[in-house]
Amino acid sequence: FGDEEERRCDPIRISMCQNLGYNVTKMPNLVGHELQTDAELQLTTFTPLIQYGCSSQLQFFLCSVYVPMCTEKINIPIGPCGGMCLSVKRRCEPVLKEFGFAWPESLNCSKFPPQNDHNHMCMEGPGDEEVPLPHKTPIQPGEE
C-alpha cells in the first residue's frame, strides 16, 4: 500500500463562492493565500461592493481570483479572463472611487489571460453585461 497521491483539487468551502458553476479549487490562490479561510476573510471586505450591484459578474470574478477553478486534468488553477476583469473593473471602479478607494493592484487585469485558449486557460464568466445599470446610491439601512 503506497502513499496515496495528494488530492489535486479541494472542495470550495467559502459560502459566497459556492454554486457558481464550479465547486473545487486548489490553493494557493491567485493573490497568494494558502488557506481558504484567509481568502474568505479578504473576500468579505468586498461585500459592500457586491451588495451595491455595480456588476452582476463581480462575485464570480472575485471568486475566480480567490478560489480559482481546479480540474484534475490540469496542474494550474484556472482564474478569470482579462476580459471579464476589465468588464467588472469598468463598472465597479467608479463605485470604489465613490467609497474613496482605488481598484486593488491585486486585481490588475493585465495579470489575467486576455481570453480562454489552449495555452492560457481562464474563465469568461457568466456573460458580459452591455445593458447599462441604473445609477445606484450606496445602500441605506433597511434596503436590500
Epitope: S15, D38, L41, T44, T47, P48, F99, F101, P104, Q140
Partner: antibody, heavy 118, light 107 residues
Framework: EVQLVESGGGLVQPGGSLRLSCAAS????????MHWVRQAPGKGLEWVAS????????YYADSVKGRFTISADTSKNTAYLQMNSLRAEDTAVYYC???????????WGQGTLVTVSS | DIQMTQSPSSLSASVGDRVTITCRAS??????VAWYQQKPGKAPKLLIY???SLYSGVPSRFSGSRSGTDFTLTISSLQPEDFATYYC?????????FGQGTKVEIK
C-alpha cells in the same frame, strides 16, 4: 452622509458593567466590519473587538475576551459593546469605526469616555 | 499576534520639512497596512490604505511604501495642519494591531 455616533459612556466602579452603542447612518451596517477601538488617556490606539453581521463573525482582543461582547442590531443599524467585569485599565475613550476595503478604518465616531474608578 | 513597532515615538520638524515615519511588523504581513492621523480630542482619520494607496481627499504630500516587513509614511513637505500624531495599523490577519504612534511637533 456616513455617520457613526457613540453613546453609553460614563463613570462605573471596578467590576461593574456598561453598554456602549454605535448608531450608524448613511450605510447598511450589515455589510461592513464594525469595530471598537479604545484609547487610554495620553496613550495610543488599541483595537478591542470587531463584528461582521453579514456572516455573524466576531473577533476580540485578548485583553477583553470573556468580559466584553460585541453585537449588532441590523434593524436599528446599531453596533453595541457590552462591557462586564470592568477594570481600571479599561478606562479610555471608546471609538466605533467602520472598515470596508483593504481593512482600512474609513469612518470613525467621535468617541465616548468610559471611566472605571471607585 | 503581529506587533507593529513604530518609530520614532516623536519628532520635531519645521514647515516644509520632509518627514518619514516607519512601522516594522514582527512577522510577514499582507499589504493591509493603513496609516492614520489623529489630532488632540479628535478621532483618527484615514490617510493611506493597502500600504501605499492614498485615501480619497487626502493631500498628495502624504505617501506610503513597503519594503518587506517595513512600512513607511512620508510627508513630502510638512504643512502647519500636519502637526499631529500618526499611527500605523495592520489588519486582516489575526487581531488588528496599531503602532504606538508618532507625535509630530513643531520645531
Amino acid at each position: 452622509e456616513v455617520q457613526l455616533v457613540e453613546s453609553g459612556g460614563g463613570l462605573v466602579q471596578p467590576g461593574g458593567s456598561l453598554r456602549l452603542s454605535c448608531a450608524a447612518s448613511g450605510f447598511n451596517l450589515s455589510y461592513y466590519y464594525m469595530h471598537w477601538v479604545r484609547q487610554a488617556p495620553g496613550k495610543g490606539l488599541e483595537w478591542v473587538a470587531s463584528i461582521y453581521s453579514y456572516s455573524g463573525y466576531t473577533y476580540y482582543a485578548d485583553s477583553v475576551k470573556g468580559r466584553f461582547t460585541i453585537s449588532a442590531d441590523t434593524s436599528k443599524n446599531t453596533a453595541y459593546l457590552q462591557m462586564n467585569s470592568l477594570r481600571a485599565e479599561d478606562t479610555a475613550v471608546y471609538y466605533c469605526a467602520r472598515s470596508s476595503f483593504a481593512w482600512a478604518f474609513d469612518y470613525w465616531g467621535q468617541g465616548t469616555l468610559v471611566t472605571v474608578s471607585s | 499576534d503581529i506587533q507593529m513597532t513604530q518609530s520614532p515615538s516623536s519628532l520635531s520638524a519645521s514647515v516644509g520639512d520632509r518627514v518619514t515615519i516607519t512601522c516594522r511588523a514582527s512577522q510577514s504581513v499582507s499589504s493591509a497596512v493603513a496609516w492614520y492621523q489623529q489630532k488632540p480630542g479628535k478621532a483618527p482619520k484615514l490617510l493611506i490604505y493597502s500600504a501605499s494607496s492614498l485615501y480619497s481627499g487626502v493631500p498628495s504630500r502624504f505617501s506610503g511604501s513597503r519594503s518587506g516587513t517595513d512600512f513607511t509614511l512620508t510627508i513630502s513637505s510638512l504643512q502647519p495642519e500636519d502637526f499631529a500624531t500618526y499611527y500605523c495599523q495592520q489588519g486582516g490577519w489575526g487581531p488588528f494591531t496599531f503602532g504606538q504612534g508618532t507625535k509630530v511637533e513643531i520645531k
